[in-house]
């Protein structure tokens, strides 16, 4: 069964910078990746970035850079402009659309006890839905 994993990482050098890493574990080719925050895409979450293997990427503040890391994983750099750190309590969700499997989505957040520079373990957390 295909699975999606999500890591949220605080940068050690800049405490206002976060990176979301997402990956797809399964067969099939990725046709689209959507990263949202505040909840799943289409269920109360706001799109932060959309990555297409051919059409390119679109991103919106506070996302700074979205890029492919491998053919089945992406990273999204975020810049926290606020004085406090709202990202620390925010849920980030990644949805991978794969042909012919369908869509798979998982969510994650920064671990409460995580030190700067340390990320959540890349444990697959297959939640929500498979369209």
């Amino acid at each position: 069964t295909p699975e999606v994993w999500v890591q949220v990482q605080m940068e050690a050098t800049e405490l206002s910078s976060f990176t979301v890493h997402c990956g797809f574990l399964g067969p099939g080719s990725i046709s689209l990746v959507t990263v949202s925050w505040g909840g799943p895409d289409g269920a109360g979450g706001t799109k932060l970035a959309v990555l297409h293997p051919e059409l390119g990427t679109r991103q919106w503040a506070p996302a700074r850079q979205a890029r492919w890391e491998t053919q089945s994983s992406i990273s999204l750099a975020l810049e926290d402009s606020g004085a406090s750190s709202p990202f620390a309590n925010t849920t980030f969700c990644c949805k991978f659309a794969s042909f012919p499997e369908g869509s798979w989505e998982s969510c994650g957040s920064l671990p409460p006890s995580s030190d700067p520079g340390l990320s959540a373990p890349p444990t697959p957390v297959p939640i929500l839905r498979a369209d």
Partner: nanobody
């Protein structure tokens, strides 16, 4: 709940121009649809697709408006525009904004898979 609100309709003379706008809003979050599109329905006729634009900026147009109408989206991703030039009497219709998501981020064949619709704005082309 997602709401689409159109504006910019009105009365214009043949050969004139109009710019329609549509804003997608949602309660509690920012809705950035993969696809936003314009449709129109003339009196006594079926609704027809006019133009669509995906989240990456790719556009599709009905043959009847190619070269005259231009669809665009704002950088924030939730507003849609339609610049209509060289308007003709046959462009008279209620213009509807529609939005929805698709498996690959592109607009589906116009008229399919768009699950949110606005109330429409009237465009009348007459001398």
């Amino acid at each position: 709940h997602v709401q689409l609100v159109e504006s910019g309709g009105g009365l214009v003379q043949p050969g004139g121009s109009l710019r329609l706008s549509c804003v997608a809003s949602a309660s509690g979050f920012t809705y950035r649809p993969y696809c936003m599109a314009w449709f129109r329905q003339a009196p006594g006729k079926e609704r027809e697709a006019v133009a669509g634009i995906d989240i990456f900026g790719g556009t599709t147009y009905a043959d009847s408006v190619k070269g005259r109408f231009t669809a665009s989206r704002d950088n924030a991703g939730f507003s849609l525009y339609l610049q209509m030039n060289s308007l003709r009497a046959e462009d008279t219709a209620v213009y509807y904004c529609a939005a929805g998501d698709s498996p690959d981020g592109r607009c589906p064949p116009l008229g399919q898979g768009l699950n949110y619709w606005g109330q429409g704005t009237m465009v009348t082309v007459s001398s």
